[in-house]
Structure formats: structure tokens, C-alpha cells
């Protein structure tokens, strides 16, 4: 279990559409971050699909991966579990009709470990800061 202080919110669904849709701008950076640590061909397919769902000018954040090997593996596992739960919720919402309030309150608080906490600042933020 990740301590509460090490959690951040991954907004799985957007709250401004009916039916709710995947908040791909929030999810995409996590998959980009873990691609070098996972099956790249599967992650590539996920990235492409998430990009198709993305609105044109939605901002994206940069994500860094925990430096510790164990934390890193936990981070990847958590992302995949969250994503799986997220998709499950989307399918449920599509099948169950407009119980939007209840659905969003369940999903928008889904936590994911904060990959930026406790890392050297040169390893976070933009892509070209890494050495």
C-alpha cells in the first residue's frame, strides 16, 4: 500500500461530458513514461488509442519514473491496474446509462502514486533535462 502522502489523483474520467469519457490527457503521460520498462509494442498501441480519444489542445504533464527498482515496478503495476479499473468503469457507465454523479464520485478520486515525489528535480519535468 502506498502512503497517503505519496498519492496523487489520476482523473480517470472527464466530468464535463455525457456519457463520461476517458481523460486521455491525464492518462497518456503515464504510459509514455513506462514504455521503456514494459512491452513497448503493447504500450505503443495504448498510446495511439489514447491519442485518438484526446481533444486537440488538451495540456499534458511530464511524468518521471521512480528511481528505485522496486518502486518503479510498483509504479508500473499501479498504472496498469488503475487503467484496467478505469476502462471497466467506462464500460459500466456506457451500459448503465446516465448515473453520472455517482460514477464520477467513484472514479475521479482513484489514486495513483506520485512519480515525482522524492526525485532529484533534474529528473523531473521536461524530457531533455535527463542525463
Amino acid at each position: 500500500m502506498v502512503p497517503e502522502s505519496n498519492r496523487t489523483l489520476l482523473l480517470c474520467l472527464t466530468s464535463d461530458s455525457q456519457p463520461p469519457r476517458l481523460n486521455s490527457s491525464a492518462i497518456l503521460p503515464y504510459f509514455r513514461a513506462i514504455r521503456p520498462l514494459s512491452d513497448k509494442n503493447i504500450i505503443d498501441k495504448i498510446i495511439e488509442q489514447l491519442d485518438k480519444l484526446k481533444f486537440q489542445h488538451e495540456p499534458e504533464t511530464e511524468i518521471s519514473v521512480p528511481a528505485d527498482t522496486f518502486e518503479c515496478k510498483s509504479f508500473i503495476l499501479t498504472i496498469l491496474q488503475q487503467f484496467s479499473a478505469c476502462l471497466e468503469s467506462v464500460f459500466k457507465s456506457l451500459n448503465s446509462g446516465p448515473q453520472k454523479g455517482e460514477l464520477n464520485s467513484k472514479l475521479e478520486g482513484k489514486p495513483i502514486p506520485n512519480p515525482l515525489l522524492g526525485l532529484d528535480s533534474t529528473r523531473t519535468g521536461h524530457h531533455h533535462h535527463h542525463h
Epitope: 509514455r32 521503456p36 519514473v65
Partner: antibody
């Protein structure tokens, strides 16, 4: 399918500059590094540098600083490499190759066909 | 810079036999419990083609007769059995640290 299409062969004079292009298709250009690699005749592969189209960030091999300049045009999904102050030592085939999506460098999984640059007076 | 030393420089193998190419790094290329060592095949007049990524992962569309192993500083590319189409030069490459570096290549020929 992912493809990287490079511009045609160049014959240039010593001291001149040349700009090579690499047009990407079949994937979302802004999410993946583009690497540039040099191969001199009958020689091995040398990494020149990478550019990340998402934010324009670059990293160069020290050997190529001041020689190569990497840029991209996101609207046309094209990466460019300008080579300046050319000498006969710069005669080579130059490849572009797709890299990873993260600050953690990854393999180069798709390659352009290469552009031959010949420097001769 | 991380120096990659490939051996042998050239290799002649009979059809159907096993070919083994070695790549030694001047320092570890491991990070996050993963080895950032990759293998490419290049035929004359063609660009390199990714065969194995991160030491042991077979790239999509590459035949299973190609395999990779190793960690930290010592890596091996194995082709078993060797086929006519495998005549080429093979390069290792590390992506753990910039600058990215390649081995000098191993030329595979048929006996």
C-alpha cells in the same frame, strides 16, 4: 504502419551546409524521439543526437556539437538535421530512427532508408 | 562514454548451425532492473533493423531463431539455426546513458 521517409542523396561542396529531412507517418510524431545516426563508408554506426518533437528538447553527441542542428516541424511530422561547414569527413549515409517516449532512452525501432551525403569540390 | 566491444569482428557459420555474438560494455547498462542493450541487423545498402530490445525482448516480426541474453556488462545475441538470409552485420547498442553508443559490428558469413 510506421514509416520514416528520408530526403534524397546530396552532393555538396566543402564549406557548404545541407539540410536533411525525415518525414514520419503511421504514429503520433510528437510522442517519440527522433534519433540521427551517421554511417561512413564501410564503417559502423555513430549516434549524432536526438530531438523530442513534443517540446523540441535536444541532446547531441559532443562529437557533433556545432556540426549538426536538429529541428522538427510538428505540423508536417518532419524532423530535420542541418549539417554545417561540411568537409570530406562528413561524407556518409545519415539515418533517422524513431526512439522512445520517455526520459528513459529506448531502442530505435524504426529507421529511415538513409540519405547519402557526398562532400566534394 | 560507454564503450561497447563486440566479438568476434567476423564470424563464419554453417547453415543450420548456431551463431553467437558477444557484446561487452565498459560499464553497466542496467537501470530499473532492466538492461538497456539492443541488437540490430544491417544488410548492405539497407538501414539497421531492430532485432532484440532491452537485452532479451524479440522485436515484433523477427523470427524466434534470434534471441538475446545477458545483464549489466555482458550480452549475447544468438542465432539458431542460421539461415541464408541472416548474412549481415550485427550491432549492439546501449541506451542507458547519453551519448548512445554502438558496438563496432560483427559480420556474419556462411561457411
Amino acid at each position: 504502419q510506421v514509416q520514416l521517409q528520408q530526403s534524397g542523396a546530396e552532393l555538396v561542396k566543402p564549406g557548404a551546409s545541407v539540410k536533411l529531412s525525415c518525414k514520419a507517418s503511421g504514429y503520433t510524431f510528437k510522442y517519440y524521439d527522433i534519433n540521427w545516426v551517421r554511417q561512413r563508408p564501410e564503417q559502423g554506426l555513430e549516434w549524432i543526437g536526438w530531438i523530442f518533437p513534443g517540446d523540441g528538447g535536444t541532446k547531441y553527441n559532443e562529437t557533433f556539437k556545432g556540426k549538426a542542428t536538429l529541428t522538427t516541424d510538428k505540423s508536417s511530422s518532419t524532423a530535420y538535421m542541418q549539417l554545417s561547414r561540411l568537409t570530406s569527413e562528413d561524407s556518409a549515409v545519415y539515418f533517422c530512427a524513431r526512439g522512445g517516449t520517455s526520459v528513459i532512452r529506448d531502442a530505435m525501432d524504426y529507421w529511415g532508408q538513409g540519405t547519402s551525403v557526398t562532400v566534394s569540390s | 562514454d560507454i564503450v561497447l566491444t563486440q566479438s568476434p569482428a567476423s564470424l563464419a557459420v554453417s547453415l543450420g548451425q548456431r551463431a553467437t555474438i558477444s557484446c561487452r560494455a565498459s560499464e553497466s547498462v542496467d537501470n530499473y532492473g532492466i538492461s538497456f542493450m539492443h541488437w540490430y541487423q544491417q544488410k548492405p545498402g539497407q538501414p539497421p533493423k531492430l532485432l532484440i530490445y532491452r537485452a532479451s525482448n524479440l522485436e515484433s516480426g523477427i523470427p524466434a531463431r534470434f534471441s538475446g541474453s545477458g545483464s549489466r556488462t555482458d550480452f549475447t545475441l544468438t542465432i539458431n539455426p542460421v539461415e541464408t538470409d541472416d548474412v549481415a552485420t550485427y550491432y549492439c547498442q546501449q541506451s542507458n546513458k547519453d551519448p548512445l553508443t554502438f558496438g563496432a559490428g560483427t559480420k556474419l558469413e556462411l561457411k
